[in-house]
Structure formats: structure tokens, C-alpha cells
């Protein structure tokens, strides 16, 4: 009876997500059969988040809209470990929008989810950011410095990375 009500709850939760994500990949977390964490298929998972590399080329605003339609945001990178995970799935000859922008062109960078911008946990390429006109951030590969961030014009289409919290059922 307990298992039955738990299953019903899970199914109704899954139905919530079905609109955007017809298929979820779930893994059992820990030893407890009741704790499952899921990411939409074919998103990848790292710690408590799911990630999707969008290969469609769009402006920053459209890229963020595209993520939000899927219940996500453009990626907010909080640690070096998280960036190291993300770059495993990126192509070296491409650039990808991050959820980081400077809306007023004042060098006041902000994350889309309002996570405080911490200068000590940023991975800008050397000499970046460097232009008041370039109000959006991308991650790209430079042979001299590997992967890092660069500021660019927000209206120039790029690929992007979406991030959402894992779905717990």
C-alpha cells in the first residue's frame, strides 16, 4: 500500500515534466529505493544538476528563452570542477553562451539565476572581459589557455549550455 501510493506520486510528478521532457533518465541515489534523481534524456548530469548543449545558433536572449522553455536557464558555473565537467561535452571550434551578462555595460556582471558574481570564481581568458559593448559571456577554447570565458556582443548567434536542477522522484 505504501509502495503503491509512492508510485502514484512518482507518476504524477513525471507527468508534470512530460510536456517538456518526454523521457527521463533516472538513477537511484544512495541505498534507499525511494530516492531517484532524474535528468531529461539526453541531458548529462553532474552533482545536483542536469546540462544540455544546445547546438542551435541563437542570440543570448533567445538562447536563455530556449533554456527556460525546457525549465532551465543558461548555465551558471559555480566551481572549477563544474566547468571541467561541462567542457568534456563541448567542441573546441565552437563558442557557447553562459548565463552571465553585463546588462548595463558597466562591468557589473550578473548570473541569470541571481547567484552573486564572485570575481574569485571566474574563468575569464587573460585580458577578458575587455569591452563595454560586449555584454554577454561565452565559454570557448584558446590554444594558449585551454577553455575560458570571453565577453562578446549579445546579438551575435552562438551555441549555448542549459542547466537545470535534477528532478527528484
Amino acid at each position: 500500500n505504501f509502495m503503491y501510493s509512492k508510485t502514484v506520486k512518482r507518476l504524477s510528478k513525471l507527468r508534470e515534466y512530460q510536456q517538456y521532457h518526454p523521457s527521463l533518465t533516472c538513477v537511484m541515489e544512495g541505498k534507499d529505493i525511494e530516492d531517484w534523481s532524474c535528468c531529461p534524456t539526453p541531458w548529462t548530469s553532474f552533482q545536483s544538476s542536469c546540462y544540455f548543449i544546445s547546438t542551435g545558433m541563437q542570440s543570448w536572449t533567445k538562447s536563455q528563452k530556449n533554456c527556460s522553455v525546457m525549465g532551465a536557464d543558461l548555465v551558471v558555473i559555480n566551481t572549477r570542477e563544474e566547468q571541467d565537467f561541462i567542457i568534456q561535452n563541448l567542441k573546441r571550434n565552437s563558442s557557447y553562451f553562459l548565463g552571465l551578462s553585463d546588462p548595463g555595460g558597466r562591468r557589473h556582471w550578473q548570473w541569470v539565476d541571481q547567484t552573486p558574481y564572485n570575481e574569485n570564481v571566474t574563468f575569464w581568458h587573460s585580458g577578458e572581459p575587455n569591452n563595454l559593448d560586449e555584454r554577454c559571456a561565452i565559454i570557448n577554447f584558446r590554444s594558449s589557455e585551454e577553455w575560458g570565458w570571453n565577453d562578446i556582443h549579445c546579438h551575435v548567434p552562438q551555441k549555448s549550455i542549459c542547466k537545470m536542477k535534477k528532478i527528484y522522484i
Epitope: 548595463g104 555595460g105 575587455n130 569591452n131 563595454l132 559593448d133
Partner: antibody
Framework: QVQLQQSGAEVVKPGASVKISCKGS????????MHWVKQAHAKSLEWIGV????????NYNQKFKGKVTMTVDKSSSTAYMELSRLTSDDTAVYYC???????????WGQGTLVTVSS | DIQMTQSTSSLSASLGDRVTITCQAS??????LNWYQQKPDGTVKLLIY???RLHTGVPSRFSGSGSGTDYSLTISNLDQEDIATYYC?????????FGGGTKLEIK
């Protein structure tokens, strides 16, 4: 080649307003913000502010807030700066300058002399 | 606001000399230091940006160096056409600010 052509010298009365222009050519106008810089006679350069030619928003030096209004006309690739409630302290050469990488002003107009005199 | 100080307001040198103009910021400006040349007719040109990078078309006799709060512009082989006033400018923090200028004259 990049060129910034400013409007001609102006003589204006105290309390009046003046609007000077800066027409950009030889590049994509909306890709580069426009800065304005003041130089009073025999004095150093003073940064007034910058306007985004793409978004139309401005960042002003606090010292010039209320004195200066910057605008842009994308269709004619022209930036404007209006100075209001003029006093003798506003007598100066005003330069427009294009925004560049590494927080720099990479190309400058020839300057517009504004003389405030009764 | 960040204060920019050019301690020498005027400098006299001979043609062919090596001339160094200095600029000090009131706080670390992370190499966002630019140098401009203003000719006697009022024309302003960018010479050097980001401490040491030469702007397009600028002769290689101009060079820049420095870090933190202390920066300098060097003209290695002074030419008649270098007679001008030189300004440093920091772009690290808004509002951008300029030094007082150094006027270069020929002996």
C-alpha cells in the same frame, strides 16, 4: 577607414542649450559605443560618458549628470550630445571617440569648440 | 574615482633621444592603461592600449610598460612629429579618468 566627423564650432549664450553631433563612417556604427570627452582650454581631458549605439543606453560620469544628454540616431550613424543650462565653465572642446577593445577609445573626432558667451 | 598622475607636465628633449613619460594610478588598474597623443592642432590619436599593445599604424618607436599602479610610455628615437601632449587613461573602472598630460617639446 574609420572616421568620426563632428559638427562645427558653436557660440551660445549662458543658460541656453547646445547639441553637437558626431557621424561615424568606415565601420559598423552599432557595433561600437560612442564616448564623449571634454577639454577646457589648457586643461586635461575629462571623460563625460558613453552611449551604446546598439542599445541606446548611457553611462555618465557623475560630474556631468544633469548637464549632458547623449543620444544616437542609428539610421544616420550619428551620435549626439546635448549640453544644457550652459555656463562659462562649459566653454571647451568636446570630442567624440569610438569605444574599442581593452577599455579604450580607439578613434577620435576632430573636436567641437563650444564657447559660452553673452 | 581613480586618480591618474603624470608627475611631469612638460618635458624637453632632443631629436633622436629616448624619452620616457610616466603615469601613476591611485589604485591597481590591472593593466587597463592607455596612452593618447594630442597634436598642437587638437587632433587626438590612440598610441598604446592595455599597457603595451601598439595601436594600428603607430610607429614601433613607441612602447609601453608597467603593471599595478605604475606605467610608462617610451619614445625610443624622438622624431619632430612626436611633438605633442601625451595623456594616460585608465579603463579599469568607470568613470574612466585621464592623467594631466605631459607636453613634449624639442630642445
Amino acid at each position: 577607414q574609420v572616421q568620426l566627423q563632428q559638427s562645427g564650432a558653436e557660440v551660445v549664450k549662458p543658460g541656453a542649450s547646445v547639441k553637437i553631433s558626431c557621424k561615424g563612417s568606415g565601420y559598423t556604427f552599432t557595433d561600437y559605443s560612442m564616448h564623449w570627452v571634454k577639454q577646457a582650454h589648457a586643461k586635461s581631458l575629462e571623460w563625460i560618458g558613453v552611449i551604446s549605439t546598439y542599445y541606446g543606453d548611457s553611462n555618465y560620469n557623475q560630474k556631468f549628470k544633469g548637464k549632458v544628454t547623449m543620444t544616437v540616431d542609428k539610421s544616420s550613424s550619428t551620435a549626439y550630445m546635448e549640453l544644457s543650462r550652459l555656463t562659462s565653465d562649459d566653454t571647451a572642446v568636446y570630442y567624440c571617440a569610438r569605444n574599442g577593445n581593452f577599455y579604450v577609445m580607439d578613434y577620435w573626432g576632430q573636436g567641437t569648440l563650444v564657447t559660452v558667451s553673452s | 574615482d581613480i586618480q591618474m598622475t603624470q608627475s611631469t607636465s612638460s618635458l624637453s628633449a632632443s631629436l633622436g633621444d629616448r624619452v620616457t613619460i610616466t603615469c601613476q594610478a591611485s589604485q591597481d588598474i590591472s593593466n587597463y592603461l592607455n596612452w593618447y597623443q594630442q597634436k598642437p592642432d587638437g587632433t587626438v590619436k590612440l598610441l598604446i592600449y592595455y599597457t603595451s599593445r601598439l595601436h594600428t599604424g603607430v610607429p614601433s618607436r613607441f612602447s609601453g610598460s608597467g603593471s599595478g599602479t605604475d606605467y610608462s610610455l617610451t619614445i625610443s628615437n624622438l622624431d619632430q612629429e612626436d611633438i605633442a601632449t601625451y595623456y594616460c587613461q585608465q579603463g579599469n573602472t568607470l568613470p574612466w579618468t585621464f592623467g594631466g598630460g605631459t607636453k613634449l617639446e624639442i630642445k
